[in-house]
Amino acid sequence: IPVIEPSGPELVVKPGETVTLRCVGNGSVEWDGPISPHWTLYSDGPSSVLTTNNATFQNTRTYRCTEPGDPLGGSAAIHLYVKDPARPWNVLAKEVVVFEDQDALLPCLLTDPVLEAGVSLVRLRGRPLLRHTNYSFSPWHGFIIHRAKFIQGQDYQCSALMGGRKVMSISIRLKVQKVIPGPPALTLVPAELVRIRGEAAQIVCSASNIDVDFDVFLQHNTTKLAIPQRSDFHDNRYQKVLTLSLGQVDFQHAGNYSCVASNVQGKHSTSMFFQVVESAYLDLSSEQNLIQEVTVGEGLNLKVMVEAYPGLQGFNWTYLGPFSDHQPEPKLANATTKDTYRHTFTLSLPRLKPSEAGRYSFLARNPGGWRALTFELTLRYPPEVSVIWTSINGSGTLLCAASGYPQPNVTWLQCAGHTDRCDEAQVLQVWVDPHPEVLSQEPFQKVTVQSLLTAETLEHNQTYECRAHNSVGSGSWAFIPISAGARTHPPDE
């Protein structure tokens, strides 16, 4: 570690005196610069000497000497006071720049340590400090304003009491810069725009920043637009606003618009799309199939997507029949706006009844005209089965009628004994009717089919069962011949 002679740590001299500071180390040593021109610097073997023949108040400061070759990087320091009765302060810098919440060092150095008790910090021309200004003083370094605030960016003077009067330093300008957390905040409205050719349009790009040094521009595709900006200050932020006002839009105005703002922290951009159309439009679509099948008693939501410009002037859901003249309850119709030009309309149909099958139409209107989208709703029913004994052309015949949707298929079973329902162990014979006769098949209604089982003689100790099934479920009816005739019954529920 180098050593300074005289040993210090402080040296007090009068103006005009000769001062010699010698730094000695094991190897070569050097003084931390910059050294003012008033000093002469020369090397003397392993030592470095600073000397001045005419000390002035401006030589007041700390002088530090280091030994570059020292692995420990040690240094020695001495603080020189040149106590000038006329000049109590040596100001090392006239401007200090810090960020908010940093400590700001105002480097006015006292030229006479005896004056330390009577020092104070004031604003220019002796004005008092702002409230809540927290500061401390070090005779070697000056005044420190702790955790400086933006509002404390002012001109300051250091004051010392000399012979009962206050003597001021030259002024020091403190600039406190706001900490910029990131690029400016942006808004671009609207987020999306559609206009008919010839209509007016407006796009507003605005940016806000914690300080005034930032730029903002609006570009169309890649072209920066010549828009005069409007400036404002509110909510403790600087605002810059660009308003693009188009009196009569044309197709060349369509495209991507980007609002771009930048500051020292970087760039931020946001975009929107402007569509110019020849005329009003109204498009209805659904992600669902327009032909819907639902099991009776279940619920269904019918959903329609609408894209329209200009906005809708009217819309409604209508039941077109065929069963009743009821109309969907308004409370079951729901509208949600996805964005300015796209909407979703939902009709909720809970616990569907047979009379609610049929066509449901969504109608919408705007200046482009009327549009409709129609759903066809068919209800699914499990089969209902009945069997009767009849004679056809003199032959005894079992006649099975099955009704349901989708169309049921029919299977006949013969099984041993008298039973309400044939189980697999009892089955003696199975007949599948590949083409039962369709008795009725009306839209939105059950399909009724008929299957015949012709038998010359029905064995008394047997059960004959007609079974029908479709995708919803199954139904059956058992027939038991008895001596007096025949008896039929459905299985127990």
């Epitope: 595709n221 890649t222 072209t223 637009l225 006002s245």
Partner: antibody, heavy 118, light 113 residues
Amino acid sequence: EVRLQQSGPELVKPGASVKISCKASGYTFTGYYMHWVKQSPEKSLEWIGEINPNTGSCTYNQKFTGKATLTVDKSSSTAYMQLTSLTSEDSAVYYCARLNYYWYFDVWGAGTTVTVSS
Amino acid sequence: DIVMTQSPSSLAMSVGQKVTMSCKSSQTLLNSNDQKNYLAWYQQKPGQSPKLLVYFASTRDSGVPDRFTGSGSGTDFTLTITSVQTEDLAVYYCQQDYSTPFTFGSGTKLEIQ
């Protein structure tokens, strides 16, 4: 209809000043930069400068700095140009012109003739 | 400043003829960001203020007859009138709006024979 209506001709003495006006109508005055152009037989068309009607901030052709001062009155949608220390070299037709968003002058005033003569 | 040079300074043509006039700039007017040339052409008829014909070197302004065509890129630009009409008697100016100060050419005077 978008229009820029300029004030009438001016006959002024050397050394004097003149202030000419340009009243905008048919559009949002603060939405576009206003520019001024000088036309003299010797020098063809010369760009003088522009003003942002929102803020009043100006950009001048260095040649006209100190000669021309641009101002606006937003309440009347009027732009002004003051010319000082006039000499015969300042005799010309002066146009105000609206700068379109796409960097061209889409609307021009009819021009104001300034004649400097003793 | 960018210097704009127009040629010829004047020309006399008959109705129906094709007219070509040139404009050269002392530095490129092609903006690398949007690949557009920041050059406009104006027509000034006697006693009138200038009227825009073409911007971005080749985009015809709405309402301008399609006999007027702008072309060129970088530093060399051309205005062509495919079939000149009597009402085309005017002075034609090119102007750069690439950087301030905006500058104009000295004009090409078109006379009809």
